[in-house]
């Protein structure tokens, strides 16, 4: 099974090396999740032609996936550490339902899908420790998530393939934006 960062032998600090700082741990965790997403995308691309679909065609899908915008304070123009951290955590919490949806969407990469989901939960915990303004973080309603999950699972095969592809692409871009922003903090 895939190991989370910090669990494999390479991450065990050598006698004279410094243990990872909180920021380094978060950085490493995001890169680990991105590796997992890339592996999952290989399977989706191999079994469907979704990867050839244009971004515009995919965007017509009515999923309300989290996305960074100027107002979120994560871009350098108008950068605001507290606002941005709230956006990253809120966005990751919103992605959780979509990561749950992905759990039954893979055959050969089932463990990888689980690892992405679990390490995202751990990442949220790391970031919550870093955040000063936890009150500003809104957690999605469980009932809303449950009905969204049911709706996604009821789609036809083509739409489910499209949804899977779009979730993975959007999650990748959200994590890349988050990583760029976190390196400014």
């Amino acid at each position: 099974a895939p190991v989370l960062p910090g669990e494999d032998s390479k991450d065990v600090a050598a006698p004279h090396s410094q243990p990872l700082t909180s920021s380094e741990r978060i950085d490493k965790h995001i890169r680990y999740i991105l590796d997992g997403i890339s592996a999952l995308r290989k399977e989706t691309c191999n079994r469907s032609n979704m990867c050839e679909s244009s971004k515009e065609a995919l965007a017509e899908n009515n999923l309300n996936l989290p996305k960074m915008a100027e107002k979120d304070g994560c871009f350098q123009s108008g950068f605001n550490e507290d606002t941005c951290l709230v956006k990253i955590i809120t966005g990751l919490l919103e992605f959780e339902v979509y990561l749950e949806y992905l759990q039954n969407r893979f055959e050969s990469s089932e463990e990888q899908a689980r690892a992405v989901q679990m390490s995202t939960k751990v990442l949220i915990q790391f970031l919550q420790k870093k955040a000063k303004n936890l009150d500003a973080i809104t957690t999605p309603e469980p009932t809303t998530n449950a009905s969204l999950l049911t709706k996604l699972q009821a789609q036809n095969q083509w739409l489910q393939d499209m949804t899977t592809h779009l979730i993975l692409r959007s999650f990748k871009e959200f994590l890349q934006s988050s990583l760029r922003a976190l390196r400014q903090m």
Partner: antibody, heavy 127, light 111 residues
Framework: EVQLQESGPGLVKPSQTLSLTCTVS??????????WSWIRQPPGKGLEWMGV???????YYKPSLKSRTSISRDTSKNQFSLQLSSVTPEDTAVYYC???????????????????WGKGTLVTVSS | QSALTQPPSMSGTLGKTLTISCNGT?????????VSWYQQLPGTTPKLLIE???TRASGIPDRFSASKSDNTASLTISGLQSEDEATYYC??????????FGGGTHLTVLS
């Protein structure tokens, strides 16, 4: 040693679609976290980034060219391609393909550094 | 979408030091360590000199160095040689998900 080679017609008529292919040798475009870019240079002018296709096959384009540009890849042939529609004489340029994605670029989505370039191919748009 | 701003031409004396500037905004040069520099000799393909703001590409002599302050990047060439006569371009990642080049600086080396 990675080598890139552009190919395609040297003359395209206005309003038509310009199609170029970049063949990569000395390394697979489907391995590592590299991305593959297109850059052009009008005669006597500077470099202009057009777009990139990354390791996952995701594409990003220069905003002002986005509506006319498409980049795709064929991993079985180790090639990636550029299509530019509705061309005008202003699209006359030397077109370069290049490899990007050094360091942490994949994780950050920042494909700003291009370490291997093709020799370039001149495309003239004229009737 | 405007390019990064570079002086169109500069001249330097053989053996001396010269610095080329590249001005951008907080959305590109100011957004992180995502700046590269290229050298284009007359009639040839651009060659990567610097990436990650300050890291020299493989095989690039240490006469070439670079730095960044706020929204401005700089390339410094020390001990100018006649073969340094070329056009130099800066490039930067620009939010979100694209890349922008400078207009290029043509360097003339005087003896």
């Amino acid at each position: 040693e990675v080598q890139l080679q552009e190919s395609g017609p040297g003359l395209v008529k206005p309003s038509q679609t310009l199609s170029l292919t970049c063949t990569v040798s000395g390394g697979s475009i489907a391995t590592s976290y590299y991305a593959w870019s297109w850059i052009r240079q009008p005669p006597g002018k500077g470099l202009e980034w057009m777009g990139v296709i990354d390791y996952d096959g995701d594409t990003y384009y220069k905003p002002s060219l986005k509506s006319r540009t498409s980049i795709s890849r064929d991993t079985s042939k180790n090639q990636f391609s550029l299509q530019l529609s509705s061309v005008t004489p202003e699209d006359t340029a030397v077109y370069y393909c290049a490899r990007a994605g050094l360091g942490d670029s994949y994780y950050l989505g920042t494909y700003y550094a291009m370490d291997y370039w093709g020799k370039g191919t001149l495309v003239t748009v004229s009737s | 979408q405007s390019a990064l701003t570079q002086p169109p031409s500069m001249s330097g004396t053989l053996g001396k030091t010269l610095t080329i500037s590249c001005n951008g905004t907080s959305s590109d040069i100011g957004s992180g360590d995502y700046v590269s520099w290229y050298q284009q000799l007359p009639g040839t393909t651009p060659k990567l000199l610097i990436e990650g703001v300050t890291t020299r590409a493989s095989g690039i002599p240490d006469r070439f160095s670079a730095s960044k302050s706020d929204n401005t990047a700089s390339l410094t060439i020390s001990g100018l040689q006649s073969e340094d006569e070329a056009t130099y371009y800066c490039a930067s990642y620009r939010e979100t998900n694209n890349v922008v080049f400078g207009g290029g600086t043509h360097l003339t080396v005087l003896s």
